[in-house]
Interface confidence: low
Amino acid sequence: APVNGSKWTYFGPDGENSWSKKYPSCGGLLQSPIDLHSDILQYDASLTPLEFQGYNLSANKQFLLTNNGHSVKLNLPSDMHIQGLQSRYSATQLHLHWGNPNDPHGSEHTVSGQHFAAELHIVHYNSDLYPDASTASNKSEGLAVLAVLIEMGSFNPSYDKIFSHLQHVKYKGQEAFVPGFNIEELLPERTAEYYRYRGSLTTPPCNPTVLWTVFRNPVQISQEQLLALETALYCTHMDDPSPREMINNFRQVQKFDERLVYTSFSQVQVCTAAGLS
């Protein structure tokens, strides 16, 4: 919990350099996101593929989409869960991070110093040990987050199942309902290839309680979809006289104390015939 208040932003006096004043963990250990670069990577053969169970949400059910002033968040049911970690981790929500139209490089994690256009986080909590995400969030490895790196490319109909509702949640506190769809469609190809490390929430209170899985391969969304994400939302309430656009809602990469990042893949990319031409 913060020392006092709960006001934080990505820009200005309450921006990330000030987070640790109110949220001490933000200046502590195991902070995320990080830069994924060769010096800190180590192959771990025990990192087997994860199974995504209950991810195919019924189209007959509606799921709450919210503008929380920091991102756009979709609530997820707890029967949706990951199998393959040491405990069962049940889903609680997903949200995104992005840049702005003039600098569309807003992923939180970077690879060899390079940002992707945006990043999706699917947040899960250890439901074997804890009754809900809130309880789990300050317990060691209480949370597991799947991170999907997003690059600009071709139109992505699955992501549009969220983006098509952005106009209904333009302002902080606004809510809309999204019909269920297969959340697994939001994941990239070859989900067996991922980075794994122990880190934190990337937003206050920055609890160092997250088991991160960052998929190696990005997904693509179109320039138009990215632009919609970068321009549709505001951090402020509808009646706020000083509206603030929801842009650049990503945290800078953090110092990587003593840790290694484990990879489920050996780092040499296999050259295809096409790649050799």
Epitope: L29, S140, E258
Partner: antibody
């Protein structure tokens, strides 16, 4: 091979400062945190704090914050710990250690220890 | 701070014995438990990290186990050179904390 060589024993007056050096060799100094550990006579081990030689970021145990300063000299791959305003409570053997890589939060190599005696 | 408790402060055993030293944390430390050996002259060595991983150069007669709050170090076939004090240490949170130590002596 990895080695951490500490400076010799010191006898200091109460109220004086003491500075211990830890000269490292056999590995890349800036790639590993250096930790400092205290052991009072006949007692257990106490973690004082750690320093990242790459940028001198320190993390100190609250208990030692007011009188301990950790520094490094990258040119000589040497870490230093200074204890100010010494009292008899600071009489101890001090160890410098290297933090293991891999997120296991262990200390894989230790110096031989430096004995500090505070006495008038 | 997390308290680390080694209930047995000293232990006598015979050469060739199987010896187990235990350590308890005041809260779940998620297997971030390390064991060190301190020889009578003061030399300290890492034996085991992350509950059960043997540090390079450490004889295979040393092993570690445990989870949650309870951990143990086992020496399967005690040798003369194992006479030392053994400390556990948690790496889950700062400040790092150690157990009080268990002194192993020959009976």
């Amino acid at each position: 091979q990895v080695q951490l060589q500490q400076s010799g024993p010191q006898l200091v007056w109460p109220g004086a400062s003491v500075k211990i050096s830890c000269n490292t060799s056999g590995y890349s100094f800036t790639n590993y945190w250096i930790h400092w550990v205290k052991q009072r006579p006949g007692q257990g081990l106490e973690w004082i704090g750690m320093i990242d030689p790459s940028d001198s970021e320190t993390r100190l145990n609250q208990k030692f914050k007011d009188k301990t300063t950790l520094t490094v000299d990258r040119s000589s791959s040497t870490a230093y710990m200074q204890v100010s305003s010494s009292t008899s409570e600071d009489s101890a053997v001090y160890y410098c250690t290297r933090g293991i890589r891999g997120g296991y939060y262990a200390m894989d190599y230790w110096g031989q220890g430096t004995s500090v005696t505070v006495s008038s | 701070d997390i308290q680390m408790t080694q209930t047995t402060s000293s232990l006598s055993a015979s050469l060739g014995d199987r010896v187990t030293i235990s350590c308890r944390a005041s809260q779940d430390i998620s297997n971030y438990l390390n064991w060190y050996q301190q020889k009578p002259e003061g030399t300290v060595k890492l034996l085991i990290y992350y509950t059960s991983r043997l540090h390079s150069g450490v004889p295979s007669r040393f092993s570690g186990s445990g989870s949650g709050t309870d951990y143990s170090l086992t020496i399967s076939n005690l040798e003369q050179e194992d006479i030392a004090t053994y400390f556990c240490q948690q790496g889950d949170t700062l400040p790092r904390t150690f157990g009080e130590g268990t002194k192993l002596e020959i009976r």
